[in-house]
Every structure is written in C-alpha cells, then in structure tokens.
Interface confidence: low
C-alpha cells in the first residue's frame, strides 16, 4: 500500500522520497518565505483502516513572507540557471524553520519527487509572478521515443483550485 501524491501547500515545495506507508516527509517553505510559528511542515503516509486507503496527513504548515529577506531581490526569470554543485538541504530552509523530526529530503537523494495523479490537469494556483507549481505523476506508458519528438497534455490554469499533488512554489531566487 502506498500513498497518493501529497496535497498542495501554498509557497511550499515537497520532494517526496518515498510513498510507502508510514513514510514521513517535510514541506520546504520556498525562498523568501518562512514557516509561520506554531505550524508544522510534517506530513506522514498513514492508513485509513476503515477504507484501507493510504493518505498523507494534512500539514498545518503556513509559509509567510520572511521580512528578513525583503531586501533580497530575486533574479529575473530570464536568466539561465545552471549548477554543478548540489546545495545542502539547510540552504533551502529560511530562518524560522522547525527542526526536522525525520530526515529531510536530501538534495543528494537519487530519487526525490513530488507527484500528481495521472490524468489530472496541471493547475497553478497562482500567477507565475506570485507562485509556482511543481507537478509530476506516476509513470504511464508512452509512445516510441524519437530523436526530437513531443507529447501533449492539457493544462488548465486556475486561480481558485488545484488538485492534490500540485505544489505552489514561491518565485524568489535565494534562501
């Protein structure tokens, strides 16, 4: 039994290491945001015994703008971004982040993810200037690959709703 994709949390991102039952994961407040005191970034894959269906617990996390980072202007989105060195998880955590109760998603992890159920529409909850979205889903079959080919999906923008597994992400550049 595995969990479906975790729910979305505004201005937070999640790279899930495992969808297995009892896995614990933490959301990361995006750059320029910090965890609001008294809220928790933790989510756990648990089993609903009545339905025998696994689901992620609802985090109480609220990510709020970090006044300490207001002076930092994000790089314009037109810049080409590359990196050969993987930053450590701590560099992703704005001040005010709670200590990890379980090992956080390491940037060095070979398989980390956030996901959305196949067939769901991709719906950013915010405009690109105010928030961004991370999505993916369980592998589905694809046609024969070619050297330069394309595959299409429908994507619907929505300002009011997003399906589980779509993760808004703040658009500032550094932590």
């Amino acid at each position: 039994i595995t969990c479906p994709p975790p729910m979305s949390v505004e201005h937070a991102d999640i790279w899930v290491k495992s969808y297995s039952l009892y896995s614990r994961e933490r959301y990361i407040c995006n750059s320029g945001f910090k965890r609001k005191a008294g809220t928790s970034s933790l989510t756990e894959c648990v089993l609903n015994k009545a339905t025998n269906v696994a689901h992620w617990t609802t985090p109480s996390l609220k990510c709020i703008r970090d006044p300490a980072l207001v002076h930092q202007r994000p790089a314009p989105p037109s810049t080409v971004t590359t990196a050969g060195v993987t930053p450590q998880p701590e560099s992703l955590s704005p001040s005010g982040k709670e200590p990890a109760a379980s090992s956080p998603s390491s940037n060095n992890t070979a398989a980390t993810t956030a996901a959305i159920v196949p067939g769901s529409q991709l719906m950013p909850s915010k405009s690109p200037s105010t928030g961004t979205t991370e999505i993916s889903s369980h592998e589905s079959s694809h046609g024969t690959p070619s050297q330069t080919t394309a595959k299409n999906w429908e994507l619907t923008a929505s300002a009011s709703h997003q399906p589980p597994g779509v993760y808004p992400q703040g658009h500032s550049d550094t932590t």
Partner: nanobody, 119 residues
Framework: EVQLVESGGGLVQPGGSLRLSCAAS????????MSWVRQAPGKGLEWVSG????????RYADSVKGRFTIGRDNAKNTLYLQMNSLKPEDTGVYYC????????????RGQGTQVTVSS
C-alpha cells in the same frame, strides 16, 4: 496544451559530451520545477536531475553527480542537460518533464531523445 520537445541526443564515444535541450510550450514554464529522466534499454525509468524555478534547489542522481549539469532558461522556455564524461551506462532515452521526480513516478514528460554512448 502542454508540449515538451527534447533534442540534442546522438551517438558519442565514452568520455564525450552532449547537451540536451527541452523546448516547453503550452504552460507557464517558469512556474514549474523541471527534471530529466532516462530509460536504459530494457530497464525502468531512472530519474537523473531536477531543478526548481529559481535554480536554488538542484538535485542529481548519484550516478551522474559531477558529470551532468542541469540548467534552464525561463526566457526561452528551455531546459538543458549538459552531459560530460559520458559512459556506456548513460545510454538510453532521455526525457524532459514537469516536476521533481522519483524513479518510476513521472509524468508528464516528452517523448525523449536517444543518447548512445559507444566506441
């Protein structure tokens, strides 16, 4: 409609380099985490690298660390993968896709570009 078009694959000798590109359209590219995954002949899907919107969260599979570099140009709606010091085991179809990815948990993605590392 979301469209992802990979290019840049080809035949290269061991130790050589390739630069893959992924042209994205039909969605707000700059608003999404993007990743590269690959599938070796007869094997399952393997996550290679992912990059968030601002580029401050970049991740690599252990098998490619120090050799591959992921990048993105949000103005051009393009994702890149610079592959250096290529090995025969890097052979496979490389897919560009939306999202941060776990092995065998990935979609949507493009239909791929073939990379063959052989002498």
């Amino acid at each position: 409609e979301v469209q992802l078009v990979e290019s840049g694959g080809g035949l290269v000798q061991p130790g050589g380099s390739l630069r893959l590109s992924c042209a994205a359209s039909g969605f707000a590219f700059s608003s999404y985490v993007m990743s590269w995954v690959r599938q070796a002949p007869g094997k399952g899907l393997e996550w290679v690298s992912g990059i968030n919107t601002g580029g401050d969260d970049i991740r690599y599979a252990d098998s490619v660390k120090g050799r591959f570099t992921i990048g993105r140009d949000n103005a051009k709606n393009t994702l890149y993968l610079q592959m250096n010091s290529l090995k025969p085991e890097d052979t496979g179809v490389y897919y560009c896709g939306v999202g941060g990815v776990a092995v065998n948990a990935y979609d949507p993605r493009g239909q791929g570009t073939q990379v063959t590392v052989s002498s």
